[in-house]
Interface confidence: medium
Amino acid sequence: EEDGFCQPYRGIACARFIGNRTVYMESLHMQGEIENQITAAFTMIGTSSHLSDKCSQFAIPSLCHYAFPYCDETSSVPKPRDLCRDECEILENVLCQTEYIFARSNPMILMRLKLPNCEDLPQPESPEAANCIRI
């Protein structure tokens, strides 16, 4: 059982990807804190020479959907929708391999950004993955 909340996204940083859709938050005040973190991360990303175009085109919306997951509207209790594991793995191991290595070894980035761990996501063919968020 989850004990979080579903609330409309009210932020700026991810508005172009999420709009005013309902997102899952673990606490009522968490959205503002995460918004500040992702804004700082995006400021860093925007000026970073370490981020390739190939990576950025999927990494930026992925980070938004990871930070502010859509609520699972098929669930009777507030529950987040996961990123799709196959896309997460392509991002980490192919499109953004160099960037992930750099980010995971850079404490300044890790302070601002919680990167998704693909191994925590449900397997592609499992029932839990049926409603995953595709980028």
Partner: antibody, heavy 121, light 107 residues
Amino acid sequence: EVQLVESGGGLVQPGGSLRLSCAASGFTFSSYFIHWVRQAPGKGLEWVAWIYPSGSYTYYADSVKGRFTISADTSKNTAYLQMNSLRAEDTAVYYCAREMDRVGYSGMDYWGQGTLVTVSS
Amino acid sequence: DIQMTQSPSSLSASVGDRVTITCRASQSVSSAVAWYQQKPGKAPKLLIYSASSLYSGVPSRFSGSRSGTDFTLTISSLQPEDFATYYCQQYRTPLGTFGQGTKVEIK
């Protein structure tokens, strides 16, 4: 060199349709927000729509919502604006423009030369 | 929707003059404001982004500033090639909005 080239403008009757194209080159098309902005004769700039080609995230101005559709073909590095149910007030030069920053929210640094759409009977 | 109210709508100035154009946002847009220059029959050109950052290749006589929801474009010493129409734009929200424009004419 970054370039955006619009095409597809012309004269169309009220209620008619037109599809504008914006061919991009010199940058990774799928990594940047692409905008359509229009300018009626003798008037100011009006933002119309944008697309994030990777994943096809889109957004529209209220004045065109439901009538215009923005799309992109990443294999051709081209953005499109399909305009249906055209009205006289849609008469304008239509520009496509690229957002400067890959993250978005940064201003439009490269613009096409514009293509004129005239809606008249 | 956020409105950007630009003033004046037009102004006459001489070469060498200091010119100031103002834009007021109807609500907070942080520093997410850009300024563009447009000449007749041409596409707009980006001058300033993030309220005060000078875009690459733009002469240093152009500058931008912010005070709350008021944004200012200043041309410190007007040059002949600066006679044009100038627009502000907010991009804080997905629906980006432009000011009405300020036409800078020769006195």
